[in-house]
């Protein structure tokens, strides 16, 4: 506990002090006081440098004195034999005696009192920046007019901070400008403009005079500009050393002016203004900016339009242009968006055709569609070449974005039919000679494939079974062969409206309009053993003349069997209708006169016993196309006959082309359109 005064006596004082003693006293007076320590008695064994016995006075780390021997007062009016004055409020006194004393020494008596110190003068370091005022137990600092005492209660400064400038234009100067600026001050000025405007500071060289830097280059007084994480300065010296125009790229600027205790100059003056924040004219490839300007600033809006073949991809949506706004931070909105080459994507596959995997699917790339030749060809033209267009579609010069359509090649057998051995005037055939041949198992009959979805046959074949099972692609109709061949499932049977339906079909004498169409559930895949026959054209070129040759095929009755195991075929000439009329009906179910002959019928055969027979019904009478000798068309359909091995009657398909086309069109699926 600090005290204002006290007494310190050597051990046993006033008796002789003992040998081998070390004793210390810690003196402490209140803060703001010094200590006056004085001795009124001193009787300690004398030795050189007081090495044996001594009293030591220590202030902090400093030894103030070391005493030994005897002393007496020089002043008859004062009992003081030795004294110490320290400006600190703590002191240590240490007494030491060695192991022997040659005489009897009485030691010492000392007193201490708290004394006032003058902080304003007693120290090397002046405690106040301006005026120092001492009082008993302390001091205080004071300032000249217009200065204020800082929180440290020692330094005076000018009240130059706290100003916030929000106007878009203004002027700021150091305190007292152009008179010398105050020493020992930190002036902070804040410029806060609306977002989207940058502070631009303008200075003239002659408007700046601040105490120069020291020999190490450090500014003693300095002016600093801070804009966000960017700093301009510190600046000092005679004439402004920095750029005369400072674009801060920020709407907020802090100006910090720091001065020390010495060397005041006239200071500085600056102007500032707010510029709309500029946004860089960015180089966005493959695009055009609208409007085009030399400089873009805050709130400017541009439309960035991609060049043809380029698009902006945002998420999954592609667009050809986007808007970008110059934002308050000097950056463009939507800056992540870029005009990329349009990607047309993996081209769609097509039925019965293919497209090679493209090296690239980007704008300008070229792909080629091909059909599965020789069984399919490209119906809608265009050559199959598509390029990736600017709108992101694969486009063909002729078809535009419409995909090519691969349709079956008709009337071309993979292997031509060659007559070999005779069988009811016919020969063994291979399905590759007649790839259009369809086998109906109930009743045992034939038909002709005319496209992927349709089979043409005789009306009398399907009148009793509207859900026929059909097969294609097999020469043999043995069960194990059919199990491996393609079975066709009917969706609907369309019998010509002119075909008369009878209660007892067995007694039929009128085979006029003996034609029907079977719509299939699924499309037929074409190949070497399955391929359609063409339909006749409507021109007079397709009118048959007597003697024109046609091919018939089927699994009908032969001389040896009721039903052929393997496909049989024959080449027959067209004959006048009267030749068929003249043949006596083998097993008549009615009067010979009752049998109807019409222009819808073709008569053929009569040569070398070649004829169709029971079980061949519905099969095509195939004639070479007059306009394309590589193709066959279905001139007729096996319909009826007076007697096997003579002449046979065939439905004249040319007369029904309109009905066939209309029926197919009206009953097509979207896939076929």
């Amino acid at each position: 506990e600090p005290t204002m005064y006290g007494e310190i006596l050597s051990p046993n004082y006033p008796q002789a002090y003992p040998s081998e003693v070390e004793k210390s006293w810690d003196i402490e007076v209140p803060e703001g006081y010094g200590i006056h320590l004085y001795f009124t008695h001193l009787d300690i064994e004398l030795s050189e440098n007081c090495a044996y016995d001594s009293v030591q006075i220590i202030s902090g780390d400093t030894e103030e004195g070391r005493l030994c021997g005897q002393r007496s007062s020089n002043n008859p009016h004062s009992p003081i034999v030795e004294e110490f004055q320290v400006p600190y409020n703590k002191l240590q006194v240490i007494f030491k005696s060695d192991f022997s004393n040659e005489e009897r020494f009485t030691g010492f008596a000392a007193y201490y009192v708290a004394t006032d110190i003058n902080e304003c003068t007693d120290f090397v370091d002046v405690p106040c920046s301006h005026f120092c005022n001492n009082f008993i137990g302390g001091y205080f600092c004071s300032c000249p007019p217009e200065y204020f005492l800082h929180d440290d209660m020692k330094n005076c400064g000018v009240n130059c901070s706290g100003d916030v400038f929000t106007a878009l234009i203004g002027e700021i100067a150091s305190p007292n400008y152009p008179k010398p600026y105050p020493e020992n001050s930190r002036c902070e000025y804040q410029i806060r403009l609306e977002k989207g405007f940058q502070v631009v500071v303008t200075l003239r060289r002659e408007d700046f005079d601040v105490e120069a830097a020291d020999s190490a280059g450090n500014c003693l007084d300095s002016l600093v500009f801070v804009a966000g994480d960017r700093q301009f300065g510190p600046y000092c010296g005679h004439g402004f050393p920095g750029p005369l125009n400072i674009e801060t790229k920020s709407n907020a600027l802090d100006i910090i002016f720091q001065t020390d205790l010495t060397g005041q100059k006239k200071g500085w003056k600056l102007r500032y203004h707010g510029d709309p924040m500029p946004c860089p004219k960015e180089d966005t490839p493959n695009s055009v900016w609208e409007p085009a300007k030399a400089k873009y600033v805050f709130r400017d809006v541009v439309q960035i339009t991609c060049l043809d073949g380029f698009e902006v991809v945002e998420g999954r949506v592609g667009a050809t242009s986007f808007y970008s706004t110059c934002q308050s931070n000097g950056k463009w909105s939507n800056s992540k968006l870029k005009c990329q080459p349009v990607d047309c994507g993996i081209p769609e596959s097509i039925e019965n055709g293919k497209v090679e995997d493209p090296e690239s699917t980007l704008f300008g790339s070229v792909i080629r569609y091909t059909c599965e030749e020789p069984y399919y060809y490209m119906e809608n033209g265009g050559g199959g070449e598509y390029h990736c267009a600017g709108n992101g579609s694969w486009v063909n010069e002729v078809l535009g974005p419409e995909l090519p359509k691969c349709v079956p090649v008709c009337g071309v057998p993979r292997e031509p039919f060659e007559e070999k051995q005779r069988i009811i005037g016919g020969s063994d055939a291979d399905i590759k000679n007649f790839p259009w041949q369809v086998f109906f198992d109930n009743p045992w009959a034939g038909g002709a494939l005319i496209n992927e979805y349709w089979v043409l046959t005789a009306a009398h074949v399907v009148e009793g079974n509207r859900e026929p099972t059909m097969y294609v692609g097999s020469t043999s109709v043995q069960t194990s062969r059919l199990a491996k061949s393609k079975m066709l499932t009917p969706e609907h049977v369309f019998i010509h409206p002119g075909w008369k339906l009878l209660e007892v079909p067995e007694g039929r004498t009128n085979f006029d309009n003996d034609i029907a169409l079977v719509r299939l559930k699924d499309p037929v895949k074409m190949g070497p053993t399955v391929s359609p026959i063409c339909l006749p054209g409507t021109s007079s070129d397709y009118n048959l003349m007597d003697g024109d040759l046609g091919l018939i095929s089927g699994w009908g009755r032969t001389e040896k069997r009721d039903r052929a195991v393997r496909l049989k075929a024959a080449r027959l000439p067209v004959a006048p209708l009267r030749k068929c009329k003249e043949v006596k009906v083998e097993k008549p179910t009615a009067d010979a006169e009752a049998y109807v002959f019409t222009p819808n019928m073709i008569c053929a055969g009569g040569e070398k016993g070649m004829d169709s027979c029971k079980g061949d019904s519905g099969g095509a009478f195939a004639v070479q196309d007059p306009n394309d000798k590589t193709k066959f068309y279905a001139a007729g359909l096996v319909s009826w006959g007076p007697q096997c091995g003579t002449y046979g009657l065939y439905t004249r398909v040319k007369n029904y082309v309109d009905w066939i086309m209309k029926t197919m069109q009206e009953n097509s699926t979207p896939r076929e359109d």
Partner: antibody, heavy 119, light 107 residues
Framework: EVQLVQSGAEVKKPGASVKVSCKVS????????MHWVRQAPGKGLEWMGT????????IYAQKFQGRVTMTEDTSTDTAYMELSSLRSEDTAVYYC????????????WGQGTLVTVSS | DIQMTQSPSTLSASVGDRVTITCRAS??????LAWYQQKPGKAPKLLIY???SLESGVPSRFSGSGSGTEFTLTISSLQPDDFATYYC?????????FGQGTKVEIK
């Protein structure tokens, strides 16, 4: 109507071979597909193989591969089935069967030939 | 190879009874299934083909049904001539396989 007449019963020793014939009448062999089926006494029917005229190849059941040979003599309309390396479990009635048309698996069956394998 | 499982293996019934025999294929055979009747010492006789088509000359009391893997032969009213062994056969591939047979005997 097709008729199939098979050769008579045979008794063979283990390890020997047997050749069963099947004569076609009422049709030509070239028009037909001939299959061979066997039936062990008191057991079920077991398909052995066939000649496929479309492919011109003979197809054998896995079980008999390497032991059976099926041949045809079209000049006499006779089919043959030869089974070698006979074992007692080959004792069975062997049938020749013509394949049917359009869904019918079989058309005509021979009367059967009993082959007995016994030492 | 496709396995054919026939059940029951033996069936005791009386004249006039309705009899059902089932056949299961180890994989789908569509409708490529036939039923045969065999009497001792005779070759099998085709009754039903295409799972449900009646062979000509076979009495209408025999009927077949099913497709894929499950098939049934039904004799609507058992006659004295019907006591025999019945086999199912798949012919969807060249490797024909038969069921093990169902013997229909007099109760």
């Amino acid at each position: 109507e097709v008729q199939l007449v098979q050769s008579g019963a045979e008794v063979k020793k283990p390890g020997a071979s047997v050749k069963v014939s099947c004569k076609v009448s009422g049709d030509t062999l070239t028009e037909l597909s001939m299959h061979w089926v066997r039936q062990a006494p008191g057991k079920g029917l077991e398909w052995m193989g066939t000649f496929d005229p479309e492919e011109g190849e003979t197809i054998y059941a896995q079980k008999f591969q390497g032991r059976v040979t099926m041949t045809e003599d079209t000049s006499t309309d006779t089919a043959y089935m030869e089974l070698s390396s006979l074992r007692s479990e080959d004792t069975a009635v062997y049938y020749c069967v013509t394949e049917g048309l359009a869904w019918r698996p079989t058309d005509s069956w021979g009367q059967g030939t009993l082959v007995t394998v016994s030492s | 190879d496709i396995q054919m499982t026939q059940s029951p293996s033996t069936l005791s019934a009386s004249v006039g009874d309705r009899v059902t025999i089932t056949c299961r294929a180890s994989q789908s055979i569509s409708s490529w299934l036939a039923w045969y009747q065999q009497k001792p010492g005779k070759a099998p006789k085709l009754l039903i083909y295409k799972a449900s088509s009646l062979e000509s000359g076979v009495p209408s009391r025999f009927s077949g049904s099913g497709s894929g893997t499950e098939f049934t032969l039904t004799i609507s009213s058992l006659q004295p001539d019907d006591f025999a062994t019945y086999y199912c056969q798949q012919y969807s591939s060249y490797a024909w396989t038969f069921g093990q047979g169902t013997k229909v005997e007099i109760k």
